[in-house]
Interface confidence: low
């Protein structure tokens, strides 16, 4: 079964999240500073002409780039696009921001810089005070709080109105921990199977505390050397590991969720191009726990994989999780060939 | 006994660590890039006039701020001050850095941004090429490796010579794990008893993988609302927890050390202002293990606290650890009143 049932579709995750229509209340919009009450946080809504027509920070954004507009979405969302405008004010306003940066947080404590797929943080903004410029975020952000940091290349006034577009992050996945993805040397090309959008920490060959390509909604193609994305390197859509590096015979991952959940199914989108060494896992074992300091509970849920492993197409495998309750999962994916390649992991839970 | 015997005194931890006098060898100084061999890493020593008189990076530091000078101290040190100079070169040099940032690491894998007590990273540097500007680091850093990132507000050449000042980190403490400090609501003021300089991670109400105010050498005053530091909030010197949040009746902490040690004593500087709810712990229980994957060994060392608990002065309590050997300690501090407030924890070991 090649599709990811119940998994969010990033193409459909593009709803306005409530700046323009005011479903985001004023109390959830805050700023580092405001030029005046008439350019305060509450005036930062896209297409709004209240007050003096936008949020304008008190001080210059050059050279420090420390002024920000913060939107609290209250719950985790996948933010797929943002829109910006300057201060039009019926033709009286001339201030806008030619570029900006985004930072985001899932918990209000740890903030991450949004970067595009090539590591660039700076986003092209507006060229005039009135027009709306939409930015498709590739990769999207899983965030509760988003900060816009307007930029300028000299001391000048900048003002901003914004909207965010996306959808509720129903998966509830806060972070996954996994070994760092590896590089496959094929005769004609190096295939980089790293998690290139991971937003957590990396230490000792392990990535932890973040989310990345395995939770971005993009499933890989049958040929893992190809990609859904433009201008990226071979292997981009997949994260992969060689059995040579795992004498235990499995890759172990941990998943942390926002709250206690009852887990029905885990869906793992895997490559199976066995002519190049990629195989579906031979089996999956998952354990559960309710809190970070607790022990993994009882016997793991085991799921052996059989069936049409000869079919080289990529597909989603469904791992039944038997209604176990937890906030943390630990899953071991058993090698059945030289490489394990995953492009997406999602969960059906209540 | 109110003093911390055997504990390092930050006022005395201000020795030059070896850039100027060359006890730090050239091989332990590295850089991201150099303008030329005559402005290479080895020319970055304070007051040195070798080569062209300083380290100068190959490219501009504006706007990216990615060029750095790295000093490897080989062993963990408490770094309390840094000194910087520009490129004087007998009056021929004009390049200096008006500001810079510091990053540091204890293991060469994980790097932390140094921040002052108010969260600012940028340090004011030099105003001329020849003068030495000393920066008192508050808080100090426990580091093996230190990186200086010079900054500029426009495209211009910057050059740097440096010294570090501090002392060997004899405690050997690599990190402590503790519940996040809480806020005490007094009638007249909110007292923030968080560990505001902690440089590790925070997750699930727990801080782990770092060091902070409990290992900075600064002991708190009798009145925990007051502070040794200027311009900080009430409660700054203490980390505190309310018994209402700990139904077990204790706060549990873990301590990781650089190597196997034989532990004689743990010293905990505690507040005892019981008119406002702060009390010394009623007892302490500690366990030991030799490796991260091992089980805690045997029965814990127990130390009951008696004596002049009525005396409201802050004091250091000494917990005898009986010569137990380990690289990890787990200690439980038992509540004897509404709040536990600690300002410093140190260890005597060999």
């Amino acid at each position: 079964d090649a599709d990811m049932k119940g998994h969010f579709d990033p193409a459909k995750c593009r709803y306005a999240l409530g700046m323009q229509d005011r479903t985001i209340p004023d109390s959830d919009i805050s700023v580092s500073s405001s030029w005046s009450d008439s350019t305060a946080a509450r005036h930062s809504r896209l297409e709004s002409s209240d007050g003096d027509g936008a949020w304008c920070p008190a001080g210059p954004v050059f050279p420090k780039e420390e002024e920000y507009l913060q939107v609290d979405l209250r719950r985790l969302h996948l933010v797929a696009l943002v829109g910006t405008q300057g201060r039009h004010a019926g033709g009286l306003g001339k201030e806008f921001s030619r570029s900006y940066r985004l930072r985001y947080s899932r918990d209000g404590r740890r903030w991450m810089d949004w970067k595009d797929r090539w590591g660039q943080e700076v986003i092209s903004g507006n060229e005039d005070p009135g027009g709306v410029v939409l930015k498709d975020l590739g990769p999207p952000m899983v965030a509760r709080l988003v900060r816009f940091y307007p930029r300028a290349d000299r001391v000048m006034s900048v003002c901003l109105r914004v909207e965010l577009y996306g959808c509720l992050w129903r998966d509830g996945l806060l972070s996954y921990t996994a070994p760092v993805g590896q590089t496959m040397q094929l005769s004609e090309v190096m295939v980089h199977l790293n998690d290139s959008t991971y937003d957590g920490y990396t230490a000792g060959g392990l990535q932890y505390g973040g989310l990345g390509q395995l939770a971005d909604g993009v499933v890989g193609l049958d040929d893992f050397r190809q990609s859904q994305e433009l201008r990226v390197w071979p292997g981009y859509d997949y994260v992969g590991w060689s059995n040579q590096s795992f004498p235990t015979g499995y890759v172990e991952m941990e998943f942390e969720f926002d709250r206690l959940r009852t887990f029905q199914t885990m869906q793992v989108h895997c490559n199976n191009m066995h002519t190049l060494g990629a195989r579906l896992p031979g089996g999956v074992e998952c354990r559960f726990k309710r809190g970070p300091a607790m022990a993994w509970e009882g016997e793991p849920v085991r799921h052996a994989l059989g069936g049409s492993l000869g079919d080289p197409r990529a597909r989603a495998i469904s791992v039944p999780l038997g209604g176990h309750v937890g906030r943390f999962l630990q899953c071991r994916f058993l090698f059945a060939g030289p490489w394990l390649l995953f492009s997406e992991i999602s969960f059906i839970s209540d | 006994d109110a003093d911390m015997k055997g504990h390092f005194d930050p006022a005395k931890c201000r020795y030059a660590l070896g850039m100027q006098d060359r006890t730090i060898p050239d091989s332990d100084i590295s850089v991201s890039s150099s303008w030329s061999d005559s402005t290479a890493a080895r020319h970055s020593r304070l007051e040195s006039s070798d080569g062209d008189g300083a380290w100068c990076p190959a490219g501009p530091v504006f706007p990216k701020e990615e060029e750095y000078l790295q000093v490897d101290l080989r062993r963990l040190h408490l770094v309390a001050l840094v000194g910087t100079q520009g490129r004087h070169a007998g009056g021929l040099g004009k390049e200096f850095s008006r500001s810079y940032r510091l990053r540091y690491s204890r293991d060469g894998r994980r790097w932390m941004d140094w921040k002052d007590r108010w969260g600012q990273e940028v340090i004011s540097g030099n105003e001329d090429p020849g003068g030495v500007v000393l920066k008192d680091l508050g808080p100090p850093m426990v580091a093996r490796l230190v990186r200086f990132y010079p900054r500029a507000d426009r495209v211009m050449s910057v050059c740097l010579r440096v010294e570090l000042y501090g002392c060997l980190w004899r405690d050997g403490l690599l990190s402590y794990t503790a519940p996040v400090g809480q806020t005490m609501q007094l009638s007249e003021v909110m007292v923030h008893l968080n560990d505001s300089t902690y440089d590790g991670y925070t997750a699930g109400g727990l801080q782990y993988g770092g060091l902070g105010q409990l290992a900075d050498g600064v002991v708190g005053l009798d009145d925990f609302r007051q502070s040794q530091e200027l311009r900080v909030w009430p409660g700054y010197d203490y980390v505190g927890w309310s018994n209402q949040s700990f139904p077990t009746g204790y706060v549990e902490m873990e301590f990781e050390f650089d190597r196997l040690r034989t532990f004689q004593t743990m010293q905990v500087h505690c507040n005892n202002m019981h008119t406002l709810g702060a009390r010394l712990p009623g007892g302490v229980e500690c366990r030991f293990k030799r490796g991260p994957a091992m089980a805690w060994e045997g029965e814990p060392v127990r130390h009951a606290l008696g004596g002049s608990l009525g005396d409201p002065r802050a004091r250091a309590i000494s917990v005898p650890l009986g010569g137990h050997v380990g690289r990890f300690l787990q200690c439980r501090f038992l509540f004897a009143g509404p709040w536990l407030l600690f300002s410093e924890i140190s260890f005597i070991s060999d």
Epitope: P247 | D258, R259, L260, T262, R290, G291, A293, M294, A295, E297, G323, H324, V325, R327, D350
Partner: antibody, heavy 121, light 107 residues
Framework: QVQLKQSGPGLVQPSQSLSITCTVS????????IHWVRQSPGKGLEWLGV???????DYNAAFISRLSISMDSSKGQVFFKMNSLQANDTAIYYC???????????????WGQGTSVTVSS | SIVMTQTPKFLLVSAGDRVTITCKAS??????VAWYQQKPGQSPKLLIY???NRYTGVPDRFTGSGYGTDFTFTINTVQAEDLAVYFC?????????FGAGTKLELK
């Protein structure tokens, strides 16, 4: 080079004590533990206890009541004493070292030559 | 205490054979497992520590793997000098415990 040399009696009377000395050379005690292990045809290899570089001991609970390990670090000697021996304590007794430093945390990498002990009247 | 169940007890081998010995711990011991070789009249010699790390000077035909409860020791191409008894040992928690041993004998 690293060496552990054992000296002690080959024959012990039932209910008597066994004393073995392990003299080490080629390394200092700091950063090492000296373990004691015995081997008998019936029970295979059994770990008895260890003394760490600070003189701290750790015993197998099954032997704790009759086992004592001590050291004289100035002489590079570790002393093993087991009381109340019975016939089923007949075995070869070994000392072995184990590093405790994080950078070289191996298992028991050097062993003594063994002391063959028979408990018999 | 943790029981280390080692199989098989005996292996009849010829030079050039590939040999696999397994050790199963009664509870998880992380990767804190060592493998030793003992020849008649000699003390045990360390071959593998932390489940998969070859000790200094040990030929690369000896390999170890495993984590948690299941561990494997392999000799890729057996040579005459490899005839000996092999033991696994857990170093995870006190008391340290050993497997019963596997004796390699010539066919």
């Amino acid at each position: 080079q690293v060496q552990l040399k054992q000296s002690g009696p080959g024959l012990v009377q039932p209910s008597q004590s066994l004393s073995i000395t392990c003299t080490v050379s080629g390394f200092s005690f700091t950063g090492y533990g000296i373990h004691w292990v015995r081997q008998s045809p019936g029970k295979g290899l059994e770990w008895l206890g260890v003394i760490w570089s600070g003189g701290i001991t750790d015993y197998n609970a099954a032997f704790i009541s009759r086992l004592s390990i001590s050291m004289d670090s100035s002489k590079g000697q570790v002393f093993f004493k087991m009381n109340s021996l019975q016939a089923n304590d007949t075995a070869i007794y070994y000392c072995a070292r184990r590093s405790t430093t994080v950078v070289a945390d191996y298992a028991m990498d050097y062993w003594g030559q063994g002391t063959s002990v028979t408990v018999s009247s | 205490s943790i029981v280390m169940t080692q199989t098989p007890k005996f292996l009849l081998v010829s030079a050039g054979d590939r040999v696999t010995i397994t050790c199963k711990a009664s509870q998880s011991v992380s990767n804190d497992v060592a493998w030793y070789q003992q020849k008649p009249g000699q003390s045990p010699k360390l071959l593998i520590y932390y489940a998969s790390n070859r000790y200094t000077g040990v030929p690369d035909r000896f390999t170890g793997s495993g984590y948690g409860t299941d561990f494997t020791f392999t000799i890729n191409t057996v040579q005459a000098e490899d005839l000996a008894v092999y033991f696994c040992q857990q170093d995870y928690t006190s008391p340290l415990t050993f497997g019963a041993g596997t004796k390699l004998e010539l066919k």
